[in-house]
């Protein structure tokens, strides 16, 4: 806390400019009018204030706006944003995407800080849903943003926003998140033709059910092994050798390299060795010839 001291004669700030960098902390406190600071916030960024001086400027704004800063000030905070605490940010009402972009720019290249997380949370809650423009902006700054949301939060993403999602935005998503995103993507891309549809839906397939994988296997999509390995094990298990062969196309030979990884390993264990042998890949571990396969899950469902 800076002590209240009178401003020395002739030092009263008429505007926010470079001369202020020579002011001591107490002089800044005494000689800079908070209302002037608020109206000229856009100038602060261009002036090489020390961290201590920025603390004083923040203190002045806090005094002027104890209930939270108005958006006109927030938009021009620049590096002063890095001084804000999540508690400060919770008082704000940020509605403009331009304001959000301006503040994300300040933190660009860094991990998502608690301040940024709070800002995004306030912004999205204020909008009511994660619309396409917001998602575009957030994933541009933080490719992993989408995967940081809970399945519940993801449920508020409208299908139209899915168009903004790039494959790298889904890299860190877990199966629960893809379970929520996949049906939205399916809806978003439903009017595309076969090959274009596959290119768009491919990144979301970790949430696809067996029926959809069977349907894809009829469309000559040539799924690569990296995508296949991300599929839900329970969705892959019911696929036949012929269906997997059609689904993977020329990539089918890649099964050998992944035969000990899930879901390939579990799928192999469910296939007849005879059927696996037709692939000519040397896959081992299938059900030996002559063995009867009982589907106990079906039996349980009936009883």
């Amino acid at each position: 806390e800076v002590e209240k001291t009178a401003c020395p004669s002739g030092k009263k700030a008429r505007e926010i400019d470079e001369s202020l960098i020579f002011y001591k902390k107490w002089e800044l406190e005494a000689c800079v009018d908070a209302a002037l600071l608020a109206t000229q916030m856009d100038r602060v960024n261009a002036i090489p204030f020390t961290y201590e001086q920025l603390d004083v400027l923040k203190h002045k704004l806090d005094e002027l706006y104890p209930q939270g800063y108005p958006e006109s000030v927030i938009q021009h905070l620049g590096y002063l944003f890095l001084k804000m605490s999540p508690e400060d940010i919770r008082k704000w009402n940020v509605t403009s995407l331009e304001t959000l972009k301006a503040l994300l720019e300040v933190n660009k290249g860094h991990e998502m800080s608690p301040q940024v997380a709070t800002l995004i949370d306030r912004f999205v809650k204020g909008r009511g849903q994660l619309d396409k423009d917001t998602l575009d902006t957030l994933t541009a700054f933080y490719p992993g943003y989408l995967c940081s949301l809970s399945p519940e939060e993801l449920s508020s993403v409208p299908p139209s926003s899915i168009w903004a999602v790039r494959p790298q935005d889904l890299d860190t998503c877990d199966p629960r998140q893809l379970d929520v995103l996949y049906p939205k993507a399916r809806l978003a891309f439903q009017n595309m033709n076969g090959s274009e549809y596959f290119v768009k839906i491919q990144s979301f397939l970790g949430g696809a059910p067996t029926e959809d994988l069977k349907a894809l296997s009829q469309q000559n999509v040539s799924m690569d092994l990296a995508t296949f390995m991300k599929l839900r094990t329970d969705a892959v298990l019911p696929l036949t050798v012929a269906e997997v062969q059609k689904l993977l196309g020329p990539h089918v030979e890649g099964l050998k390299a992944e035969e000990r990884h899930r879901p390939v390993r579990d799928w192999i264990l469910r296939q007849r060795q005879d059927d696996l042998d037709t692939l000519g890949l040397g896959l081992q571990g299938g059900i030996p010839n002559g063995y009867l396969v009982l589907d106990l899950s079906m039996q349980e469902a009936l009883s």
């Epitope: 690569d224 990296a226 390299a257 992944e258």
Partner: antibody, heavy 119, light 108 residues
């Protein structure tokens, strides 16, 4: 440019553990498995196991089962290989090597990390 | 596990000479699942040939690979000074993946 950058040399006492890191850059991290291969002084290459960075699934060579743990951190595109209960025979250069998912050959290798186990 | 035996262990060759390295497997290896690596002193291994005969990116055409079943061959058609290295065959046809013991090629 595709690069695998490994952590620096380590000297450990018998019975201790060592954790070697391998940071990937210049490609889509989740499209490639990361394998670990070691080479004892003046010896050949020995495959230790692999990790699928997308799923976190691991496969270990039976010889190292129970002593080796491979993990990944997608947020930093880094994989780790930890070897426990070290003995003098574990003195070697440890390499991480990239392997495209669906293939079995290693197209890019890290620079290697020398681990010396000595009392 | 499949044991890969390379021969010879060591070869001293004059430049422009042809070099042949063999890799013999203790049981059959599907040819798509065999590769060769080159390792120069104090360097990491480098992929040379994959799927028995496919040249990796940037590898000179004087290198070639062939073979099937249990017998595979790496050939350097006209040896150059920069080819001084140890060469390893590697199989991923059967678990665990294994490497040959290596063949050291020295320039005379």
């Amino acid at each position: 440019e595709v690069q695998l950058v490994q952590s620096g040399a380590e000297v450990k006492k018998p019975g201790a553990s060592v954790k070697v890191s391998c940071k990937a850059s210049g490609y889509t991290f989740t499209d490639y498995n990361m394998d670990w291969v070691r080479q004892a002084p003046g010896q050949g290459l020995e495959w230790m196991g692999d990790i699928n960075p997308s799923t976190g699934g691991t496969i270990y060579n039976q010889k190292f089962q129970g002593r080796v743990t491979m993990t990944e951190d997608k947020s930093t595109s880094t994989v780790y290989m930890e070897l426990s209960s070290l003995r003098s025979e574990d003195t070697a250069v440890y390499y991480c090597a990239r392997r495209r998912i669906g293939t079995g050959y290693f197209d890019v290798w890290g620079q290697g990390t020398t681990v010396t186990v000595s009392s | 596990e499949i044991v890969l035996t390379q021969s010879p262990d060591f070869q001293s060759v004059t430049p422009k000479e042809k070099v042949t390295i063999t890799c013999s497997a203790s049981s059959s290896v599907i040819s798509s699942y065999l590769s060769w690596y080159q390792q120069k002193p104090d360097q990491s291994p480098k992929l040379l040939i994959y799927r028995t005969s496919n040249l990796a990116s940037g590898v000179p055409s004087r290198f070639s690979g062939s073979g099937s079943g249990t017998d595979f061959t790496l050939t350097i058609n006209s040896l150059e000074a920069e080819d001084a290295a140890t060469y390893y065959c590697h199989q991923w046809s059967s678990f665990p993946y294994t490497f040959g013991g290596g063949t050291k090629v020295e320039i005379k």
